[in-house]
């Protein structure tokens, strides 16, 4: 898939920034706001941001520019530059208010059919588990295979470099076709098939990708928020996997939640399956030592481990993946809509 160009975005932050540069008032306000970075730190929800008056004024001036409301795309070129602009402008919109974080990513749903030739899988034993089958589907696709090998190499060996491994994981989940990436990670296993569950848990090479000692979850979030890409992915996840009511129904479509979830893999906030026997997921962090922020920490942790929206989205995608290999399909070759999902 070609990477989205700026022009395909409704209002790319890169384009909006160029427009702003052409206007002296906007340009000066943007530069001033950019220099306010250190004084407007990202507060924790429990903290009140303190904003200098001149920063407030610069923010006010930017509120009428096309920068307000500009967006980025998960697969665009210069994504990090776009996100840098987004978060600078975001300060103008929310003035450091943590609760007002909005995903920087524009929603684009691809409806391009994804062709799969299941007849190529006849080299596998008929009773092979589905995680093995989805891994084989990836191997049979040049792009998926190349990207998977790249992160496999970066994440293996006793002396793997975690930051290199994470970068390759990010690249895989960004550039591999979404159905391949989702099939690989969200493959269904029979309840007692520990081998399949182990394969699924090891998909993201947790021994290298995850921290050897679990950090505090709030510290992990602080670290994530200091990086525009990680912050963007976390906010995107919180936007699209947000359980909106007492029964935890997804605020947006399940497919958007899953895309946001996969977008976290390779960032500091990389989640994973917690065991071989079920589909529970969690961050690799702890709330021990959180002091009077224990409850806040548990709520952050719970956004992954106790999130009914995410749980249902994963379960629905796994049911869908099971159906791909059921006997209901009339032909060995068929097309699956890339955005198809149960809701």
């Amino acid at each position: 898939d070609p990477l989205p160009t700026e022009s395909r975005l409704m209002n790319s932050c890169l384009q909006a920034r160029r427009k702003c540069q052409a206007d002296p008032t906007c340009s000066a306000a943007y530069h001033h706001l950019d220099s306010c970075t250190s004084s407007i730190s990202t507060p924790l929800p429990s903290e009140e941001p303190s904003v200098p008056a001149d920063c407030l004024e610069a923010a006010q001036q930017l509120r009428n520019s096309s920068l307000i409301g500009c967006m980025c795309h998960r697969r665009m070129k210069n994504q990090v530059a776009c996100l840098d602009i987004y978060w600078t402008v975001h300060r103008a919109r929310s003035l450091g208010n943590y609760e007002l974080d909005v995903s920087p990513y524009e929603d684009t749903v691809t409806s391009k059919p994804w062709k799969m030739n299941l007849s190529k899988l006849n080299m596998l034993k008929p009773d092979s588990d589905l995680c093995l089958k989805f891994a084989m589907l990836c191997t049979l696709n040049d792009k998926c295979d190349r990207l998977r090998k790249a992160y496999g190499e970066a994440c293996s060996g006793p002396h793997c470099q975690r930051h290199v491994c994470l970068r390759q994981l990010l690249t895989f989940f960004e550039k591999a076709a979404e159905p391949h990436a989702q099939g690989l990670l969200l493959c269904p296993c029979a309840p007692n098939d520990r081998g399949c569950g182990e394969r699924r848990r090891n998909t993201i090479a947790p021994n290298c990708a995850l921290p050897p000692v679990a950090p505090n979850c709030l510290e992990l979030r602080r670290l994530c928020f200091s990086d525009p890409l990680c912050r963007s992915r976390l906010v995107d996840f919180q936007t699209h996997c947000h359980p909106m009511d007492i029964l935890g129904t997804c605020a947006t479509e399940q497919s958007r939640c899953l895309r946001a979830y996969l977008g976290l893999i390779g960032t500091a906030m990389t989640p994973n399956f917690v065991s071989n026997v079920n589909t529970s997921v969690a961050l690799s962090c702890t709330c021990r030592g959180s002091g009077n922020l224990q409850e806040e920490c548990e709520m952050l942790e719970g956004f992954f481990s106790h999130n009914p929206c995410l749980t249902e989205a994963i379960a629905a995608k796994m049911r869908f993946h099971s159906q791909l290999f059921s006997q209901d399909w009339p032909h060995p070759t068929f097309a699956v809509m890339a955005h198809q999902n149960e809701n």
Partner: antibody
């Protein structure tokens, strides 16, 4: 320590009203959805109602709909159950309960802290 | 409303026995099922949530399984403190409903 303490139970006649309270401590009350569950003497558990953290959403069991009203005062960390038009079949121990802190806003993961219960007897 | 049917209604067992309690929902509830233990005069205690996840502080001899309509609570080796009444509860849709309970008694 997380604690829920119910009060307000007592003996009333059919058709009368009663208001139960549940005082919460040890957690940020306004973050949590809350629930009332009751248990008639010698019988099983029956869910009564639930309220969102803000108090904006409430849901009721069919058996109490239109007669019971659940509310909360987040400034006082207190949950209420206003029971009107009471019937003999409302006789029960009433418990308030909260969901786990990792799932504070919804009840999909059960109720991990319960009060000790308050007894309501409706009899003529 | 979703009906939750628990069986058996009572079971007599000895310390060390394996005890299995089942709960059936009248319609699919995904994995949104909780199990509680209640002793006379006490409030219920959460044992299992989301069908199979063990609540913090609950002994590992308790386990839950199932999804959709059929669920199981298993006590692998019954201990003296496990003699109590056990309830399942669906948390998939309103109104929430409990099973009728299973009393585990000393044989």
């Amino acid at each position: 320590e997380v604690q829920l303490v119910e009060s307000g139970g007592g003996l009333v006649q059919p058709g009368e009203s009663l208001r139960l309270s549940c005082a919460a401590s040890g957690f940020t009350f306004s973050n949590y959805a809350m629930s009332w569950v009751r248990q008639a003497p010698g019988k099983g558990l029956e869910w009564v109602s639930v309220i969102s953290g803000s108090g904006g959403s409430t849901y009721y069991a069919d058996s109490v709909k239109g007669r019971f009203t659940m509310s909360r005062d987040n400034s006082k960390n207190t949950l209420y159950l206003q029971m009107n038009s009471l019937r003999a079949e409302d006789t029960a121990v009433y418990y308030c309960a909260k969901p786990p802190s990792r799932a504070a806003r919804y009840f999909n993961y059960g109720m991990d802290v319960w009060g000790q219960g308050t007894t309501v007897t409706v009899s003529s | 409303a979703i009906r939750m049917t628990q069986s058996p209604s009572s079971v007599s067992a000895s310390v060390g026995d394996r005890v299995t309690i089942t709960c059936r929902a009248s319609q699919g509830i995904s994995s949104w099922l909780a199990w509680y233990q209640q002793k006379p005069g006490k409030a219920p205690k959460l044992l299992i949530y989301a069908a199979s996840s063990l609540q913090s502080g609950v002994p590992s001899r308790f386990s839950g399984s199932g999804s959709g309509t059929d669920f199981t609570l298993t006590i692998s080796s019954l201990q003296p403190e496990d003699f109590a009444t056990y309830y399942c509860q669906q948390a998939n849709s309103f109104p929430f409903t409990f099973g009728g309970g299973t009393k585990v008694e000393i044989k």
